[in-house]
């Protein structure tokens, strides 16, 4: 659709967002050199005034953290980068319309896997995001995605798996063999926006059954 600019100073300006941490990234084109510097601006949908991002003016690195500037997850944003190289004209490129709610990817959950003799307990820890509620506290993923649930799998061996899923944070796989190694995986899913995290994986071994020794 687009004929690339002949200046070749700047390309692929885009947001990369994970758990609502929104990083603007870009590449230098074939004409960029070590003295090429980049300046970043951002704005909300429908606003015409671009705002300069402090700390991302005339920089040489090819990324800029815009999390705080784009932290309203119901808003649409744009960012643009202007590249300047010695003696040449500036080149500006802007992102596509960005919504962290739509575009953020979900990281694997933080989980503690606790082995017992005949069961394995899995405790999912809440994931805080930079998104603020109206009263100013940081929202968890669960508070942002009301449909969020966890899918848990326990691989007993190559042929047999156990499954649990739900919205709660504490789970227990029961009826396991003592002193046996299991592979657990826990994934976050948000069906409405079709998001799925990579799984958190834990390898745990149930505790040996010591009761027979005292019988």
């Amino acid at each position: 659709h687009t004929t690339v600019d002949t200046s070749g100073l700047l390309q692929h300006v885009k947001f990369q967002s994970s758990n609502f941490e929104n990083i603007l990234t870009w590449d230098g084109g074939p004409a960029s050199t070590s003295d090429t510097v980049y300046s970043v601006e951002y704005k909300k949908y429908g606003e015409r005034k671009w705002l300069a991002k402090a700390g991302c003016q005339r920089i040489t690195q090819k990324f800029c953290n815009l999390t705080m500037e784009t932290r309203n997850h119901t808003e649409f944003y744009y960012a643009k980068v202007t590249a300047v190289s010695a003696g040449g004209p500036p080149v500006t490129k802007m992102t596509d319309r960005f919504s962290s709610l739509q575009h953020t990817t979900i990281k694997p959950p933080d989980v503690t896997c606790i082995p017992k003799v005949r069961s394995i307990q899995m405790l999912v820890h809440p994931t805080l995001t930079p998104v603020l509620s109206e009263d100013g506290h940081q929202l968890t993923l669960e508070e942002i995605f009301h449909d969020l649930f966890y899918r848990l799998e326990l691989h007993v061996n190559h042929t047999y798996q156990m499954h649990l899923e739900g919205k709660q944070r504490e789970y227990e796989f029961l009826g396991l063999t003592p002193d046996t190694e299991f592979l657990g995986s826990i994934t976050i899913l948000t069906p409405i926006l079709s998001k799925e995290s990579a799984p958190y994986v834990c390898r745990v071994k149930t505790l040996p059954d010591r009761t027979w020794a005292y019988s």
Partner: antibody, heavy 116, light 113 residues
Framework: EVQLQQSGPELVRPGTSVKISCKAS????????MNWVKQSPEESLEWIGE????????TYNQKFEAKATLTVDQSSNTAYLQLTSLTSEDSAVYYC?????????WGQGTTVTVSS | DIVMTQSPSSLAVSVGEKVTMSCKSS????????????LAWYQQKPGQSPKLLIY???SRESGVPDRFTGSGSGTDFTLTISSVKTEDLAVYYC?????????FGSGTKLEIK
């Protein structure tokens, strides 16, 4: 001063295609979205679609998806609207218009007349 | 698609009179993140391109005379010209940018008596 200069009027045969240009000056084409709007006596103003000249990403009005193709040439600061399989219903004035929501600058319009 | 309905389709007034024209949308245009309405007004004089007058329902574009005022919220919007001048002879269009596809009203033609 921001200006959008469109190509001249077109008289074309039914079934053929036409490509209209919109050259931006006074700003970098890649610093804002470009939209295209159709104006005909029957339908008033109709939004055809938008393009992000930096990425080439397009969003079309479903009504025009099979009819219109939006492109840009960054090196010449020019946006294009191509219309295919023309019929008399495509006879209209076509405008390019800048910005991502409402439209703050408009080209002067290109009249397309489809006639055998 | 959001349907924009303008009324009246035309009106004739004398110089110096106050004019109001209506634009109604088939669904609310209130953008929750900034509590503004995604509505713009344009003026198109004979033989010219449309010109932006008002955006966010009530923000006047730079250089537009202050006799032009936009108001309203949700689904009902109004453009008011407080004291019409001869150069205001034009067709006035509203446009929503709340959701794709962006849509326009069919216009109100202002004629001078």
């Amino acid at each position: 001063e921001v200006q959008l200069q469109q190509s001249g009027p077109e008289l074309v045969r039914p079934g053929t295609s036409v490509k209209i240009s919109c050259k931006a000056s006074g700003y970098s084409l890649t610093a804002d979205y470009m939209n295209w709007v159709k104006q005909s006596p029957e339908e008033s103003l109709e939004w055809i679609g938008e393009i992000n000249p930096s990425t080439g990403t397009t969003t079309y009005n479903q009504k025009f998806e099979a009819k219109a193709t939006l492109t840009v040439d960054q090196s010449s600061n020019t946006a294009y609207l191509q219309l295919t399989s023309l019929t008399s219903e495509d006879s209209a004035v076509y405008y390019c218009a800048r910005f991502d929501a409402y439209f703050d600058y408009w080209g002067q319009g290109t009249t397309v007349t489809v006639s055998s | 698609d959001i349907v924009m309905t303008q009324s009246p389709s035309s009106l004739a007034v004398s110089v110096g009179e106050k004019v109001t024209m209506s634009c109604k949308s088939s669904q609310s245009l209130l953008y929750s993140s900034n509590q503004k309405n995604c509505l713009a007004w344009y003026q198109q004089k004979p033989g010219q391109s449309p010109k932006l007058l008002i955006y966010w329902a009530s923000s006047r574009e730079s250089g537009v005379p202050d006799r032009f005022t936009g108001s309203g919220s949700g689904t009902d919007f109004t453009l008011t010209i407080s004291s019409v001048k001869t150069e205001d002879l034009a067709v006035y269009y509203c446009q929503q940018y709340f959701s794709y596809p962006f849509t326009f009203g069919s216009g109100t033609k202002l004629e001078i008596k």
